[in-house]
Each structure stands twice: as structure tokens, then as C-alpha cells.
Interface confidence: low
């Protein structure tokens, strides 16, 4: 289970049509589920119901984003429609570059996604927990345009880091 | 801040056409399904139509198939309800929907003011 | 298609515990999603995947159930929460909607 460094990018825009950008970095940890590669796209935040879908079809939508996912208390979802790997694989299918969970509140989940499976997922699938998961969800939540770099080895630079 | 505003509803004979017309502005348009949903007194809330972010899917219900085409315009943020050989039971407050969450359409997030459509002749 | 049942009407006293029952005709997993709608206006969503508060929403409100019986509770009712309440299902397709059910204040 190789670390994932994580730049979060924030884009802020000021009256003047201006944008100002903060950069946050945050670790987590590749899982088993998903290949250890680079990855980088604008933020969609997924909640983990909208990864139903009783359609057999599958919806490609444009290539190139980074699903995160907050995972719930599992007592808020007794049944849930998909396993947490099978909701990595429906993002992916839905043309995420990578997703990235959010196992604070479901941290069993951590062993679902490292179990490996005979056939992984081509891109990554990364959980984050504590205070990396509290930075990441407090960008996520602003409802901005952010973008994430995930990369398995730090960053070459060092990175300016502003506590979101 | 999310803002959907509707346009092009009226007063329209029986067999006649209309197009609705939605304005989105406040949020990535190209990440979301959208959906019309209507309201008539004497039937409620009902769903009539969705659509996928990149606009590859539609959906609708039964009753309105053939009849109705939902599109919408990415580029423009606009999306769109044709209704043709409008009928009796068309007459409704039509509204433009923002599913949620991302990439997954599963309740109706935002709504639009409305717009009404009266087929009478 | 799946069929909602709600309670047509409800007359309460301001500061009362109130809870509006939804029905659906099979299970439709936590997949009930919560709308109120003011005289004049459009609909607001409350509550989706039956309990989760959307954002906004005060926590006079909140949400349960799971397979075909669910549950609005508003406590404790204030007199801006006249409105009808309107609950829709996502599991099942076409996603349907309640019938509503109007909350009055004495």
C-alpha cells in the first residue's frame, strides 16, 4: 500500500474576473483496487448513493475528472447497492481518471479495497482518513472549481501549503 | 449560487408546439443531468423528462414518449423541452430541474421559478 | 411504476413534533428524497437518501426509513413550515413522486 501525495488546487476567483490559486497538499494511500499511477483532474464530488443505478446501460460522460467520495457510517446505508469497489468501478466507468474515497466514517472499507482483485481497476483508487480527509472534504465542500494531482512519489518542488 | 430560469411556456392550441427553454448559471452545467418536471392541481409533481451531462442520454416517461424532446446546450449552459401535438393534459407548471449529485441523477437538487403551459383552444 | 402513498393534510400548533409518513408500493431501498413547497413557489429539497439534511435545511428537519416506510419529522414546527411536503423515489424507474401532504399551523 504505497502513499499517495496528493496537490489539491483551488481556484478563487476575485471580482476582477481574476483567479487566485491555493495549493494543498494532503497523503493517502493507493489501494489495492486501483493501479499506482498519476492522475490529475478537475474535482467531482459523487455522494456514494448517486453511485446507484438500476439502469443496465452504462452513461460515458467526458473523460478526465477525479471523483472523491465521502463514504458513510455503514448503519446509514444497511443495504448499500454496490460494494465500495464496485462504486470505484462505476466512477471509472463513468470516465473518472481516478477516485478518491474518503474512509473517516466507514474505515472497514480499507480492507474492501485492498483485498486485490484478479482484475484492478486501470487507474487509481486512493482513501484518505483524518486530517488529510478533513482538508480534502473542507476544499471539496466549498462547492469550487479545485483540481487534483495525485502522484506516487512527492512532489519535486515544495509545495506552498494553505491550511483550507 | 445555483440559479435555473425558465422560458417560452404560454398559452398554446390543442396539436400545437412549444419549446421550453432553461437558463443554468451558478455551478459546472456540464457535470450534472437535468429533468423537467411538471405540475398539474390535478396530478402533482411528475417527471417528464432527464437528460445526461454530456447530453448522449435521454430519458422520459411513458406517457410522453415521441411527443416530447429534451436537449440541451452545453456550450450555452441551456437546456431545452421540444413538446409537440400538445394535448389537454399537457397543461401543467413545467419545471427545469438540476439533479444531484454529480454524474448521477438521483432527487432534483435545484428548480427553476417555472414556467406555465396552458393548452386550450 | 412505484407508487407513493402520503397522508393528504396535517393541522398542527406551532412547536408541535410532527412527523409525514410516505408509503411506497415496493421497496425502494433508502431511496426517498424529501421536497417542501410553499404556496406560489417552486420545490425545495430537504432531505435525500431518506435521513441526509441537504445543505441549508435546519435541523428541525430530519429524515428515516428504509425499504417501503418512510418519515419526515419536523421538530419543532414553525409557522414558516406551512407548505405541502412532497416525497419522490430514485430506486425504481421512472422516479416518481408522492401525492403530498399539506401541513397547515393552527
Known amino acids: 500500500k504505497e502513499t499517495a501525495f496528493v496537490e489539491v488546487v483551488l481556484f478563487e476567483s476575485s471580482p476582477s474576473g481574476d483567479y487566485t490559486t491555493y495549493t494543498t497538499g494532503l497523503t493517502g494511500r493507493f489501494s489495492r483496487a486501483g493501479a499506482t499511477l498519476s492522475a490529475e483532474g478537475e474535482i467531482v464530488q459523487m455522494h456514494p448513493l448517486g453511485l446507484c443505478n438500476n439502469n443496465d446501460e452504462e452513461d460515458l460522460y467526458e473523460y478526465g475528472w477525479v471523483g472523491v467520495v465521502k463514504l458513510e457510517q455503514p448503519e446509514l446505508d444497511p443495504k448499500p447497492c454496490l460494494t465500495v469497489l464496485g462504486k470505484a468501478k462505476r466512477a471509472v466507468q463513468r470516465g473518472a481518471t481516478a477516485v478518491i474515497f474518503d474512509v473517516s466514517e466507514n474505515p472497514e472499507a480499507i480492507d474492501q479495497l485492498n483485498q486485490g482483485s484478479e482484475d484492478p481497476l486501470k487507474r487509481p483508487v486512493v482513501y484518505v482518513k483524518g486530517a488529510d480527509a478533513i482538508k480534502l472534504m473542507n476544499i471539496v465542500n466549498k462547492q469550487k472549481v479545485a483540481r487534483a494531482r495525485i502522484q506516487h512519489r512527492p512532489p519535486r518542488q515544495p509545495t506552498e501549503y494553505f491550511d483550507m | 449560487e445555483v440559479h435555473l430560469v425558465e422560458s417560452g411556456g404560454g398559452l398554446v392550441q390543442p396539436g400545437g408546439s412549444l419549446k421550453l427553454s432553461c437558463a443554468a448559471s451558478?455551478?459546472?452545467?456540464?457535470?450534472?443531468?437535468m429533468a423537467w418536471v411538471r405540475q398539474a392541481p390535478t396530478r402533482g409533481l411528475e417527471w417528464v423528462a432527464s437528460?445526461?451531462?454530456?447530453?448522449?442520454?435521454?430519458y422520459y416517461r411513458d406517457s410522453v414518449k415521441g411527443r416530447l424532446t429534451i436537449s440541451r446546450n452545453n456550450a450555452e449552459n441551456t437546456q431545452y423541452l421540444q413538446i409537440d401535438s400538445l394535448r389537454s393534459e399537457d397543461t401543467a407548471t413545467y419545471y427545469c430541474?438540476?439533479?444531484?449529485?454529480?454524474?448521477?441523477?438521483?432527487?432534483?437538487?435545484?428548480w427553476g421559478q417555472g414556467t406555465l403551459v396552458t393548452v386550450s383552444s | 411504476d412505484t407508487v407513493l402513498t402520503q397522508s393528504p393534510a396535517l393541522t398542527v400548533s406551532p412547536g408541535d413534533k410532527i412527523t409525514i409518513s410516505c408509503r411506497a408500493s415496493?421497496?425502494?431501498?433508502?431511496?426517498i428524497h424529501w421536497y417542501q413547497q410553499k404556496s406560489g413557489q417552486q420545490p425545495k429539497l430537504l432531505i435525500y437518501?431518506?435521513?441526509n439534511l441537504d445543505s441549508g435545511v435546519p435541523d428541525r428537519f430530519s429524515g428515516s426509513g428504509f425499504g417501503t416506510d418512510f418519515t419526515l419529522t419536523i421538530d419543532p414546527v414553525e409557522a414558516s413550515d406551512t407548505a405541502t411536503y412532497f416525497c419522490?423515489?430514485?430506486?425504481?424507474?421512472?422516479?416518481?413522486f408522492g401525492g403530498g401532504t399539506k401541513l397547515e399551523l393552527k
Open positions: 430541474s438540476r439533479l444531484g449529485p454529480a454524474y448521477s441523477g438521483e432527487w432534483f437538487a435545484y
Open positions: 451558478g455551478f459546472t452545467f456540464s457535470n450534472y443531468d
Open positions: 437528460i445526461s451531462p454530456g447530453g448522449g442520454k435521454t
Open positions: 415496493e421497496g425502494v431501498n433508502t431511496r
Open positions: 437518501g431518506a435521513s
Open positions: 419522490q423515489q430514485s430506486w425504481n424507474v421512472p422516479h416518481t
